[in-house]
Interface confidence: low
């Protein structure tokens, strides 16, 4: 399908203008290509009448031009002038009228309505209210006032001065005669409908001194604005349908090939399944205006929304609409991202995040999409620091890869992580996206002590274990805090070809912290990343308290709380992977130091990834 | 879906009467929240706008070439469009369709979403 998308059908009246607007995908090459504007012949051939190239056919000399606007990815044709004659088929395009790169539009231009001379024209949206004024002359002010709806040859009573009202107008119409001397009687109907569309009569008295005067009431549909998005972006339909329904229910609805209007989201809680996860309905303001953003946009969200009021929270005849025609461009701009995490409870996911690569200044955020009533999505991290405390020690928000992609990882999963996120930032709104993270049946790959608690002072190191599928990853410790985590400086790696050939006591890498001090109290993450690309992480808390007895301190299972998915069999005893290990340095390294005099090469904290023998056992 | 169903085509004498009706049926939305018209094609040529009625009944707009000759109306009980055609000229020899539209704009734009399979009307000198 063409990824060039105009409005369908143009409407208009001899004499006026139109001007219709085509958007592009804006790549290098769309920018700079010709744009057209061109008729459809019988022989199905393409007529250009107006090009960018400053070509204008001569039936369009002086009243046509083509506009492009390569920064927005549109372009804009204006006809001036319009006659019968300019009523058919035509196509806006890029390239060469027969490629295909184009979009057809219908134009239709008729005629105005013949109306009696002297008639008032209003010209109204549906949903709104119309005032028609009518005058009288003073010997008719006494007498009876009425409007009257002209359908075909007859006339039909609509309202009059003696409170009748025809039942078709029942609760939304009303007579104002005003004080004495004001010579004007007007009628105000409310919450228009398509069907109040017509020629009335206003009359005052009756017979051959009555007076008259005609009054044609034009109730319009809205005509649909045009939004063009990329897939898998974000879309944001604000609607404003004015203080008169700032209190009634809003909804937004999708109208099918039925033609009625199903609902997307309302604010009395109901919400189309298809949407789950990514729309949410912004509070109203005060003036009863408010936004829908949908984010993760599929083609098949393509077609005609409608928002609008009423108590029901549904559409219904006679009240306010706004319309919008979503387009969902397929060549998109915004990268392919995992739409789904899955994470095992215990372990981490770390979540690639698009945004605007020429926006990379741009604040970046990670929200919990909420489902409750409306929806909402209470900020997690931001690039600047943590928000939300209960996230503290598990969640980070990192600039890398960089480039257009941020990443956030969160650890420590529990079943009440499962939902769904939003990465978005303080620019541009079009690339929001979600991820919906899902926490599945399986172990961590990465297996650290519980919490730990360190002497001041004294040596510390914190063992972490991976799989054999991790053994070419760069392994890292950092520690956390609420502006990132910091990666800690890595002492030797051991021999390489132990990684290569996934030697049994290559698998561990170890944090030592030599001496540890008050300012080492916290969390640790360990972590694998190929590159710039996060995997998986797991963390520890480090307790520090003071010194009790002088001597070594080897951190052995005993001494630190077990992982959640580990069991603390005996004092030196753990299973991991249903594997017992029996040796108590498992969780040390030799390098531990005696006291606290000397500091082996100056390093307070190190990262080891040795496979020396000392090490003792390994898990399969 | 909407289905419009045309009737009353068939061969007249020039000068002569003849009325078209069509009949809505399937519509999701009720039959008065719809414009209607007439269309029609001659052989070898292109449709072309005829008369439409407004969702109401309340207006009525015609192509100049049967202004005076042709009335639209509408019954809104019976779900039906008729086309009254007096005077018929040879001129007139056409498949007469009826059409529906969701929108409506004033004067005779009628941007159709429905349309019938269309009648027959001949007109013989």
């Known amino acids: 399908k063409s990824p060039v998308f105009g409005p369908q059908e143009v409407s208009s009246v001899e004499g006026n203008s139109v001007s219709i607007k085509c958007y592009y995908p804006p790549t290098s090459v769309n920018r700079h290509t010709r744009k057209y504007w061109c008729r459809k012949g019988a022989s199905g051939r393409c007529i250009t009448l107006v090009s960018s190239e400053g070509y204008v056919s001569s039936n369009y000399a002086g009243r046509a031009n083509l506009t492009n606007f390569p920064e927005n990815g549109t372009f804009v044709v204006n006809i001036a002038q319009l006659s019968r004659d300019d009523s058919g088929h035509y196509k806006c395009g890029l390239g060469i009228n027969s490629r295909g790169l184009s979009f057809d539009v219908s134009l239709e231009v008729s005629q105005g309505p013949e109306l009696p001379n002297g008639t008032e024209v209003y010209t109204v949206d549906v949903g709104r209210t119309v005032t028609i004024k009518c005058p009288f002359k003073t010997e008719n002010a006494p007498k009876t006032k009425a409007l009257y709806k002209k359908i075909g040859q007859t006339s039909v009573l609509v309202i009059d001065s003696r409170n009748y009202v025809n039942p078709n107008y029942k609760d939304r119409i009303r007579l104002r005669i005003p004080g004495t001397g004001q010579l004007i009687f007007t009628v105000v109907i409310d919450r228009l409908r398509l069907s109040d569309h017509g020629l009335y009569l206003c009359q005052a008295g009756d017979g051959s001194n009555r007076d008259e005067k005609n009054a044609d009431l034009q109730v319009l549909e809205p005509e649909p604005e045009l939004v063009y998005e990329d897939l898998r972006g974000s879309v944001t339909f604000h609607c404003a349908l004015g203080l008169e329904v700032a209190n009634v229910a809003k909804f937004l609805c999708r109208v099918n090939s039925r033609e009625t209007c199903d609902v997307v989201i309302n604010t009395l809680g109901k919400r189309d399944s298809a949407f789950e996860g990514r729309i949410l309905l912004n509070p109203q303001d005060k003036d009863g205006s408010f936004s829908v953003v949908i984010t993760g946009l599929r083609k098949e969200d393509e077609g005609r929304y409608l928002c609008g009021a009423h108590s029901d929270g549904q559409l219904q005849e006679g009240w306010p609409i706004q319309a919008w025609q979503l387009f969902v461009n397929e060549e998109s701009t915004i990268p392919r991202s995992p739409t789904v995490v899955k994470g095992v409870a215990g372990g981490s996911v770390a979540v690639l995040c698009p945004y605007n690569p020429k926006e990379s200044q741009s604040l970046k955020y990670w929200c919990l999409w909420e489902g409750a009533q409306n929806g909402r999505c209470p900020l997690l991290v931001e690039s600047q620091g943590l928000v939300q405390e209960q996230y503290e020690g598990r969640l980070s928000l990192l600039q890398e890869p960089g480039n257009g992609t941020f990443t956030v990882i969160l650890n420590q999963l529990t079943t009440q992580d499962a939902g769904f996120y939003w990465c978005l930032t303080n620019g541009d709104t079009r690339w929001r996206t979600t991820v919906e993270i899902k926490i599945i049946e399986g172990e961590p790959n990465l297996k650290v002590p519980g919490n730990v608690t360190a002497v001041l002072g004294e040596t510390l190191n914190i063992p972490c274990h991976f799989p054999c599928k991790f053994s070419s990853y760069e392994k890292y410790w950092c520690k956390w805090s609420n502006t990132g985590c910091q990666t800690l400086p890595s002492q030797d790696e051991g021999p390489s070809e132990a990684f290569v050939n996934c030697d049994e006591n290559s698998r561990l890498v170890s944090l030592t912290l030599n001496p540890v001090t008050r300012a080492d109290e916290g969390w640790y993450w360990c972590g694998v990343k190929q590159g710039h690309f996060y995997g998986e992480t797991a963390a520890v808390y480090v307790a520090v308290e003071e010194k009790k007895v002088a001597g070594s301190r080897y951190v052995s299972p005993a001494k630190a709380d077990a992982a959640p998915d580990e069991k603390v069999l005996d004092s030196g005893v753990r299973e991991i992977e249903n594997k017992a290990i029996q040796d108590p340095r498992l969780f040390a390294e030799e390098k531990v130091v005696a006291d606290t005099g000397d500091q082996a090469g100056g390093s307070r904290a190190s990262v080891d990834s040795s496979s020396s023998e000392e090490q003792g056992g390994s898990s399969k | 879906q909407v289905q419009l169903v045309e009737s009353g085509g068939g061969l007249v004498q020039a000068g002569d009467s003849l009325r078209l009706s069509c009949a809505a049926s399937g519509r999701a939305l009720s039959f008065n929240t719809y414009a209607m018209a007439w269309f029609r094609q001659a052989p070898g040529k292109e449709r072309e706008f005829v008369a439409s009625?407004?969702?109401?009944?309340?207006?009525?707009y015609y192509a100049d070439s049967v202004r005076g000759r042709f009335t639209v109306t509408r019954d809104s009980g019976k779900n039906t469009v008729t086309l009254r055609m007096n005077s018929l000229k040879p001129d007139d020899t056409a498949v007469y369709y009826c059409?529906?539209?969701?929108?409506?704009?004033?004067?005779?734009?009628?941007?159709?979403?429905?349309w019938g399979q269309g009648t027959l009307v001949t007109v013989s000198s």
């Open positions: 009625i407004t969702y109401n009944g309340g207006s009525t």
């Open positions: 059409a529906s539209a969701q929108y409506w704009r004033s004067g005779t734009s009628f941007p159709a979403n429905y």
